[in-house]
Interface confidence: low
């Protein structure tokens, strides 16, 4: 099960500080909520489970008391607090519960925690640059590709999708991997549209936790004229 | 001690084929369950199938389990692979307590599955250059096979990034390589593919206008973002 928006949640914290992670389970047993940590290259492991009937936390062996705390009474408002963070606490944290109808464990959509000792710029939201289709592509292929470059953001968790103006339909786009550049990240996404859509305005919509005011950033790609130029392909 | 081992860190397989993911486990329990989960790029963890230690081989749609209790092996086969099956797959052993709601899962490290397009006719790419300020993007469209070298040709490089190579909706490949150059106006792109070289200049058009399609109105095309 996953949260409704399908949004990858992320939290960035400095070493030594605390973080709060919320649970977003849609179904399953409310009585016992389990917390798992998955770090890249390792097996996911349970940290603890919370018994809501007795409001008690049962820690896995090797987990130091005081590191984690949980509160809340249902799967919708259950939260876990992580204290005295170190870089090795970075990873994806899942809450989970057993399905009441069928013996299987259901996981929340996961929250990525990034713990860093670096002092980041005050603004680590994605900085956009737009690329419009080349004339060669529009004339030779009767299609055009828009490219949306996003730079200097942190942490690396980002979602990009494309829409036409005045439409909520998500268009089929493609994207590169998120790449590390110094202490921040960059990513780009591109959208190829047929000639008939080139005269429409397109939007590259970017979801990132450090966007201004916490809202999706919309990068506008203007409609383009393809009829003003007559062309003669060199070699095609 | 309970332990789960997924020895394959990653596997690749073409669409429509089947892939088998191996999982070995150690347990002192006699009765238990093994679970398979799929982790999407978004990190969402989705339950796929469950195998009981006292049950016949489990099957659910395109997922089937080959369970060998004596060998402590529980292999997952995904048949008729689709591009959307590309993900990381985890095998997990359920620790049975007296009270199932507190049971723990012991996971393996996971196997990354990459589903590739089918073998198909070799297709030469189209190559186009897109520019904005010092930024240059080389767009390489609809090629097969995947192996490709993309070079942005410039004498004044600031920085370059590794290309992104992705499966196109038509099942071929698309790629984009980005770079920053002081002389962006003179940058061209050359591509080595299938022992041939393709240049962006091969696709250029004779025109008395600028290098790029014009916006309908005079708009700032650098960073017209709104929050």
């Amino acid at each position: 099960s996953s949260n409704l928006e399908g949004r990858t949640k992320s939290v960035i914290r400095q070493t030594g500080s605390s973080a709060e992670i919320t649970c977003d389970l849609a179904e399953g047993s409310t009585g016992y909520i389990h917390w798992y940590l998955h770090q890249e290259g390792k097996a996911p492991q349970r940290l603890l489970y919370y018994d809501s009937y007795t409001s008690s936390v049962v820690l896995e062996s090797g987990i130091s008391p005081g590191k984690y705390d949980t509160y809340g009474s249902t799967r919708k408002n259950l939260r876990m607090i992580l204290r005295n963070l170190i870089e090795n606490d970075s990873g994806v944290y899942y809450c989970a519960t057993w399905d009441e109808k069928y013996y299987k464990k259901l996981f929340g959509s996961g929250t990525t925690l990034v713990v860093t000792d670096k002092q980041l710029d005050a603004d680590v939201s994605p900085k956009p640059t737009i690329f419009l289709p080349s004339i060669a592509e529009t004339k030779l292929q009767k299609a055009g590709t828009y490219l949306c470059l996003l730079e200097k953001f942190f942490p690396d968790v980002i979602k990009i999708h494309w829409q036409e103006k005045k439409s909520n339909t998500i268009l089929g786009s493609q994207e590169g991997n998120t790449m590390k550049t110094n202490d921040t990240y960059m990513k780009f996404s591109w959208l190829t549209v047929p000639e008939k859509s080139l005269d429409k305005e397109h939007r590259c919509i970017v979801r990132h936790e450090n966007n201004k005011n916490g809202v999706d950033q919309e990068i506008i790609f203007p409609p383009i004229k393809t009829d003003v130029i007559t062309m003669d392909p060199k070699d095609n | 001690a309970q332990k789960v081992t997924q020895a394959q860190s990653s596997v690749s397989m073409p669409v429509r084929k089947a892939v088998t993911l191996n999982c070995l486990y150690e347990t002192s329990w006699w009765s238990y369950y093994i679970f398979w989960y799929k982790q999407l790029p978004s990190k969402e963890m989705i339950f796929l199938i469950r195998q009981g230690s006292d049950e016949q081989n489990a099957k659910s749609g395109r997922y089937s389990v080959n369970f060998k209790k004596a060998a402590k092996s529980v292999a997952l086969t995904i048949s008729a692979l689709q591009l959307e099956d590309s993900a990381k797959y985890f095998c997990a052993l359920g620790e049975p307590n007296h009270f199932l709601n507190t049971d723990k899962l012991i996971f393996g490290k996971g196997t990354r599955v990459t589903v590739e397009p089918r073998s198909q006719p070799h297709t030469k790419p189209s190559v186009f250059v897109m520019k904005n300020g010092t930024n240059v993007a080389c767009l390489v469209k609809e090629f097969y096979p995947k192996d490709i070298r993309i070079n942005l040709v410039s004498s004044k490089k600031i920085t370059e990034f590794d290309p992104a190579i992705v499966i196109s909706p038509s099942g071929k490949y698309n790629a984009v390589k980005l770079g920053k150059y002081e002389d962006s106006n003179s940058v061209t792109c050359s591509v080595q593919h299938d022992n041939k070289t393709v240049h962006s200049t091969d696709f250029e058009v004779k025109t008395d206008s600028t290098d790029h399609v014009k916006p309908k109105e005079t708009e700032n095309t650098k960073q017209p973002s709104k929050s």
Partner: antibody, heavy 130, light 107 residues
Framework: EVQLVESGGGLVQPGGSLRLSCAAS????????IHWVRQAPGKGLEWVAS????????YYADSVKGRFTISADTSKNTAYLQMNSLRAEDTAVYYC???????????????????????WGQGTLVTVSS | DIQMTQSPSSLSASVGDRVTITCRAS??????VAWYQQKPGKAPKLLIY???SLYSGVPSRFSGSRSGTDFTLTISSLQPEDFATYYC?????????FGQGTKVEIK
């Protein structure tokens, strides 16, 4: 200009054989796929077989599997349909067709090789009768 | 195999009428559906591909749409040259399959 021209049809007795040809021009069969579709008199369209000549992949309808063989000679830019053990129900106009490779805006199982048919030949009539 | 159930099998209409033909796939075929027009003694002609994309050169009065496994071909204003038989086709999975056809006749 893209063109497909079928030939080789005719009257044949049940159990007999026939080889249909599909000569392509305006494109290379090695860079595309070729498909055979038939239409029995007064009936609808029925897909028969497909070939991807560069990879060698072939596909057949259950009704012809084991009796028909699709092939291509890239040097002649021609595709063939070898039809053996012919039956009365194989009587039809046989068309060869080429797929339309435009950028499709969707994903689906199997990926690249699927496309609608934009160019068709004029058809060749095969009559199986004693 | 994916069955394509096309309806109606025939219809009578007048010039200027709006005509709708539907095809239901027995299982998901994504948008890998095409529509063809065929006239007697001629090869089929591609009208619509990818469920809703108009093939080049086809008049804009033809349109296609998809809702789940239901696919629709609409002719917004029937013209004299549109009287023909129409077929849907799924090409998302082998074997490729066609609908049974819809004959559009003059009322």
């Amino acid at each position: 200009e893209v063109q497909l021209v079928e030939s080789g049809g005719g009257l044949v007795q049940p159990g007999g054989s026939l080889r249909l040809s599909c000569a392509a021009s305006g494109f290379t069969v090695s860079s595309s796929s070729i498909h055979w579709v038939r239409q029995a008199p007064g009936k609808g369209l029925e897909w028969v077989a497909s070939i991807y000549s560069s990879s060698g992949y072939t596909y057949y309808a259950d009704s012809v599997k084991g009796r028909f063989t699709i092939s291509a000679d890239t040097s002649k830019n021609t595709a063939y349909l070898q039809m053996n053990s012919l039956r009365a129900e194989d009587t039809a106009v046989y068309y060869c067709a080429r797929p339309y490779y435009w950028y499709p805006y969707y994903y689906w199982s199997g990926g690249w090789e699927y496309a609608a048919f934009d160019y068709w030949g004029q058809g060749t009539l095969v009559t199986v009768s004693s | 195999d994916i069955q394509m159930t096309q309806s109606p099998s025939s219809l009578s209409a007048s010039v200027g009428d709006r005509v709708t033909i539907t095809c239901r796939a027995s299982q998901s075929v994504s948008s890998a559906v095409a529509w063809y027009q065929q006239k007697p003694g001629k090869a089929p002609k591609l009208l619509i591909y990818s469920a809703s994309s108009l093939y080049s050169g086809v008049p804009s009065r033809f349109s296609g749409s998809r809702s789940g496994t239901d696919f629709t071909l609409t002719i917004s204003s029937l013209q004299p040259e549109d009287f023909a038989t129409y077929y849907c086709q799924q090409y998302g999975e082998y074997p490729i399959t066609f609908g049974q056809g819809t004959k559009v006749e003059i009322k």
